[in-house]
C-alpha cells in the first residue's frame, strides 16, 4: 500500500513538474524589464526563449520571434537545449511510469518488470528535473551578468548632452516556474526510485533443510516454493530476483521491509 502511494504520488508530482517545465519553456517572461526607480513604464519589455515582447500603455502587445538560429547567443541555445531535453526525458518518463504504476494492471506484467520501469522513469524524472534547473540557472546567471554590465554603463552620454537609457532585464516569472517545476520533477523522480525498491522482490538466501528419508533426499524451500530434490550446489535454493511472480502466500507471509517505507 505504501509503495503504491509513493509511486502514485511520485507520478503525480512529476506530472505537475513536467507540465511546469513545458509551461516555463513556452513562457515569454524569462527576463523582464527592470523597473528600477520607475514602477510605472509606458513601454514594458520582456523576453522568452523563443521571442521578445513589448507591451505598451495602450495595451498593445507586440511579440517578435527569434527567426535566426545562428545569430542567437550560445547560452540561449544551450538553455533551449536543456529545457527541450528535460521535456523529452520527462515525457518519456511519464509514458514509462504509466505502465509501471502498481495500480494499473497490464496483462501479466510481473512486479520485477514494473520495478525496473519505475526505476527507469524515476531516473528520467531526476535527469529531466536537473536539466530544467540547470537551464533556468544558466539563464539566470546570464541575466545577472548582463544586469551588472548594463548597470555599469547605464547611461552612455553622447557629447554629455544626450542620454541613451539602456534597458536592464531582471528575473521573469518563467524562471521561478522553471525552478519550482524542475524541483518537483526531481522530487517525483526520487519518489519513483524509492517506490522501485518496494516493488522489487528481495534477494534473500534461504538454507534448505534436508531430510534423509527412504534413501531419497528432499530439500524444502520455505515460502511456497517447490522443493527441489538432491543435495549439492543447488542454486535454486535462493529466492532469486527473477522477475518472478510472488504467490499470495509469499506476499502475506514474507512482506518486504520496503513495503513499510
Amino acid at each position: 500500500m505504501a509503495v503504491t502511494a509513493c509511486q502514485g504520488l511520485g507520478f503525480v508530482v512529476s506530472l505537475i513538474g513536467i507540465a511546469g517545465i513545458i509551461a516555463a519553456t513556452c513562457m515569454d517572461q524569462w527576463s523582464t524589464q527592470d523597473l528600477y526607480n520607475n514602477p510605472v513604464t509606458a513601454v514594458f519589455n520582456y523576453q522568452g526563449l523563443w521571442r521578445s515582447c513589448v507591451r505598451e500603455s495602450s495595451g498593445f502587445t507586440e511579440c517578435r520571434g527569434y527567426f535566426t538560429l545562428l545569430g542567437l547567443p550560445a547560452m540561449l541555445q544551450a538553455v533551449r537545449a536543456l529545457m527541450i531535453v528535460g521535456i523529452v526525458l520527462g515525457a518519456i518518463g511519464l509514458l514509462v511510469s504509466i505502465f509501471a504504476l502498481k495500480c494499473i494492471r497490464i496483462g501479466s506484467m510481473e512486479d520485477s518488470a514494473k520495478a525496473n520501469m519505475t526505476l527507469t522513469s524515476g531516473i528520467m524524472f531526476i535527469v529531466s528535473g536537473l536539466c530544467a534547473i540547470a537551464g533556468v540557472s544558466v539563464f539566470a546567471n546570464m541575466l545577472v551578468t548582463n544586469f551588472w554590465m548594463s548597470t555599469a554603463n547605464m547611461y552612455t552620454g553622447m557629447g554629455g548632452m544626450v542620454q541613451t537609457v539602456q534597458t536592464r532585464y531582471t528575473f521573469g516569472a518563467a524562471l521561478f516556474v522553471g525552478w519550482v517545476a524542475g524541483g518537483l520533477t526531481l522530487i517525483g523522480g526520487v519518489m519513483m526510485c524509492i517506490a522501485c525498491r518496494g516493488l522489487a522482490p528481495e534477494e534473500t538466501n534461504y538454507k534448505a533443510v534436508s531430510y534423509h528419508a527412504s534413501g531419497h533426499s528432499v530439500a524444502y524451500k520455505p515460502g511456497g516454493f517447490k522443493a527441489s530434490t538432491g543435495f549439492g550446489s543447488n542454486t535454486k535454493n535462493k529466492k532469486i530476483y527473477d522477475g518472478g511472480a510472488r504467490t499470495e502466500d509469499e506476499v502475506q507471509s514474507y512482506p518486504s521491509k520496503h513495503d513499510y517505507v
Partner: antibody, heavy 118, light 113 residues
C-alpha cells in the same frame, strides 16, 4: 466609432475647485487609459496624467500632483478630472484623450475651457 | 523628464512647397525591445483639438494624407510635408511617448503665404 464628449466651459474663482467630465462611447471604456492634457491659450500641450478605468489606477505628471485628481465611473463610461486651489495659471483648455498604438493619443474630446478669474 | 525641442518655431511657405520640421529629444526614444521609436506627431488647427498624424516616428495614422512623412531615430526626428496644401495651416507638435511623463515639443507653426 470612438467619441469623447467633454463638459462645457466654466468660469471659476481663484482658490475654488472645478470638476470636468469626459463621457466615452464607441469602445470598451474600462480597457484603455484615459489621458488628460492641458493647453494654455497660445501655448503648447502638457500631459497632466492618466487613469485606467478598469481598476482606477492613476499616473500623474509630478507637476500636477496635488492639483489634479483623476477618477472614473465605469457605469456611465465617464472620466473626471478635479482641479483644486485654482489660480490664473490654471486657466486653460483641458482635453481628455484616449491612448492608442505607440502610446499616441488618437481620440480627443473637444476640450473644456476653464477660466480662473475673480 | 525628457525634453523635446522643436525647430523652427514657425515657418512660412508657399503652397506646393516641400517642408521639413525638426524635433530633438534629450534622451533616446528608441526601444530596444522592438526597435521602435516612441515619437508621435500631431497637427493642431486653430480652435480644434490636436489630430494624430504619425506614431512610432514613421507610421502614418489611417486617413492621414501620404504627403506627411515621419522619419528619424533615437533622438533626431523629422516631419516632412512633401507638397504643402492650404489646409495644412496648423501648429505641429512632436511628443515623447516612450517614458513618463509624456512630454510635448513647443510646436512648429506652419503658415501659408
Amino acid at each position: 466609432q470612438v467619441q469623447l464628449q467633454q463638459s462645457g466651459a466654466g468660469l471659476v474663482k481663484p482658490g475654488a475647485s472645478v470638476k470636468i467630465s469626459c463621457k466615452a462611447s464607441g469602445y470598451a471604456f474600462s480597457s484603455y487609459w484615459m489621458i488628460w492634457v492641458k493647453q494654455r491659450p497660445g501655448k503648447g500641450l502638457e500631459w497632466i496624467g492618466q487613469i485606467y478605468p478598469g481598476d482606477g489606477d492613476t499616473n500623474y505628471n509630478g507637476k500636477f500632483k496635488g492639483k489634479a485628481t483623476l477618477t472614473a465611473d465605469k457605469s456611465s463610461s465617464t472620466a473626471f478630472m478635479q482641479l483644486s486651489s485654482l489660480t490664473s495659471e490654471d486657466s486653460a483648455v483641458y482635453f481628455c484623450t484616449r491612448i492608442y498604438y505607440g502610446n499616441a493619443f488618437a481620440y480627443w474630446g473637444q476640450g473644456t475651457l476653464v477660466t480662473v478669474s475673480a | 523628464d525628457i525634453v523635446m525641442t522643436q525647430s523652427p518655431s514657425s515657418l512660412t511657405v508657399t503652397a506646393g512647397e516641400k517642408v521639413t520640421m525638426s524635433c530633438k529629444s534629450s534622451q533616446s526614444l528608441l526601444n530596444s525591445g522592438n526597435q521602435k521609436n516612441y515619437l508621435t506627431w500631431y497637427q493642431q488647427k486653430p480652435g480644434q483639438p490636436p489630430k494624430l498624424l504619425i506614431y512610432w516616428a514613421s507610421t502614418r495614422e489611417s486617413g492621414v494624407p501620404d504627403r506627411f512623412t515621419g522619419s528619424g531615430s533615437g533622438t533626431d526626428f523629422t516631419l516632412t510635408i512633401s507638397s504643402v496644401q492650404a489646409e495644412d495651416l496648423a501648429v505641429y507638435y512632436c511628443q515623447n511617448d516612450y517614458s513618463y511623463p509624456f512630454t510635448f515639443g513647443s510646436g512648429t507653426k506652419l503658415e501659408i503665404k
